[in-house]
């Protein structure tokens, strides 16, 4: 029979012939040959192949640098890579997470719409009208401002994006 | 196929490299170990080189050994200081936990 | 590394009689474990590989099993071509090392 020139899936052609992929967790060894199936073996401590492969070699699993402010957030198999993350207060400079920043606090004026994650830093948003912020905060929204009226009281300062309304006595009627 | 060269004759205390030659398969997708037998004896596994070119060894090994690809189609074993229980028949043979393609063998002996 | 151990050093059957060789490792090997043929002034020829599969050519009157640190080769119906030495080989992961059982004997009379 005419020698293959292609392959079927999880299948790789040497040598005129087509051999078996090795399967996730294993590296390619030796090629197959008309009297053996490809010799695969499996990745060490500490290594991974992720895909179908001939690989000679495994990958070796992401260090999660302590000194870059990352831990481990999931243990590396010899199927998958270790996923880094970054400890409380940090999150992650890129999706490889290869290194961590400080989250950002929001500076007054503007109130936190998405706490930050391992992985996304602080969302800030402008406080809209009827709402403050007077701190620098990783985790406060904007407060909405005081209701003078329900307190019995009348707005004796007017609010911004930064301050809370004042409040004060009404005035008595004079007889 | 894979063939053995360089066994012979040596003093103790002399070193000595045997070659691999391998045709038909490529040594840069496929590993080579190095075995070798005493006479009336059983097999021995020395150690591997990888298609990467890593070389792993026995622990017994480790130290007296030393493997590597010297062109593209041979592989050598490289002996430092031998003694008379090196006296052997070498093989190196295709393959890394199991071996399908084995050379006939060079015999080393060491004697005085 | 793993240590294979190989029973029994010597076995005689008459032709048509059954051989079982039983090779132990000193640590679990998963099924990474070969076994070998070898004839006097010959090479070792391969037999079996990932514990019990047959190398293209091999008389399917050789079946080999086991996984962990148990495994065994079982030669029927034997012929006198089967008289030789019996190897096992087994893979140590955790350093990336080989090792071959001490080998069984087979006499065929």
């Known amino acids: 029979p005419e020698p293959p020139t292609a392959c079927r899936e999880k299948q790789y052609l040497i040598n005129s012939q087509c051999c078996s992929l090795c399967q996730p967790g294993q590296k390619l060894v030796s090629d197959c040959t008309e009297f053996t199936e490809t010799e695969c073996l499996p990745c060490g401590e500490s290594e991974f192949l992720d895909t179908w492969n001939r690989e000679t070699h495994c990958h070796q699993h992401k260090y999660c640098d302590p000194n870059l402010g990352l831990r481990v957030q999931q243990k590396g198999t010899s199927e998958t890579d270790t996923i880094c993350t970054c400890e409380e207060g940090w999150h992650c400079t890129s999706e490889a997470c290869e290194s961590c920043v400080l989250h950002r606090s929001c500076s007054p004026g503007f109130g936190v719409k998405q706490i930050a994650t391992g992985v996304s830093d602080t969302i800030c948003e402008p406080c809209p009208v009827g709402f403050f912020s007077n701190v620098s905060s990783a985790f406060e929204k904007c407060h909405p401002w005081t209701s003078c009226e329900t307190k019995d009281l009348v707005v004796q300062q007017a609010g911004t994006n930064k301050t809370d309304v004042v409040c004060g006595p009404q005035d008595r009627l004079r007889a | 196929s894979v063939e053995e060269s360089g066994g012979r004759l040596v003093t103790p205390g002399t070193p000595l490299t045997l070659t691999c030659t391998v045709s038909?398969?490529?040594?840069?997708?496929?590993?080579i170990s190095w075995v070798r037998q005493a006479p009336g004896k059983g097999l021995e596994w020395i150690g591997v080189?990888?298609?990467?070119?890593?070389t792993y060894f026995a622990s017994w090994a480790k130290g007296l050994f030393t493997i590597s690809k010297t062109s593209s189609t041979t592989v050598d074993l490289q002996m430092t200081s031998l003694t008379t229980e090196d006296t052997a028949t070498y093989f190196c043979?295709?393959?890394?936990?199991?071996?399908?393609?084995w050379g006939p063998g060079t015999l080393v002996t060491v004697s005085s | 590394d793993v240590v294979m151990t190989q029973t029994p050093a010597s076995v005689s059957e008459p032709v048509g009689g059954t051989v079982t060789i039983k090779c132990q490792a000193s640590?679990?090997?998963?099924?990474?474990l070969a076994w070998y043929q070898q004839k006097p002034g010959q090479p070792p020829r391969l037999l079996i590989y990932?514990?019990?599969t047959l190398a293209s050519g091999v008389s399917s009157r050789f079946k080999a099993s086991g996984s962990g640190t148990e495994f065994t080769l079982t030669i029927s119906d034997l012929e006198c071509a089967d008289a030789a030495t019996y190897y096992c080989?087994?893979?140590?992961?955790?350093?990336?090392?080989?090792?071959f059982g001490g080998g069984t004997e087979v006499v065929v009379k």
């Open positions: 043979a295709r393959g890394w936990s199991r071996h399908d393609f």
């Open positions: 038909g398969f490529s040594l840069s997708s496929n590993a």
């Open positions: 080189i990888d298609a990467g070119g890593s």
């Open positions: 640590q679990s090997i998963s099924n990474i």
């Open positions: 990932s514990a019990s």
């Open positions: 080989q087994g893979y140590d992961s955790t350093v990336g090392v080989g090792a």
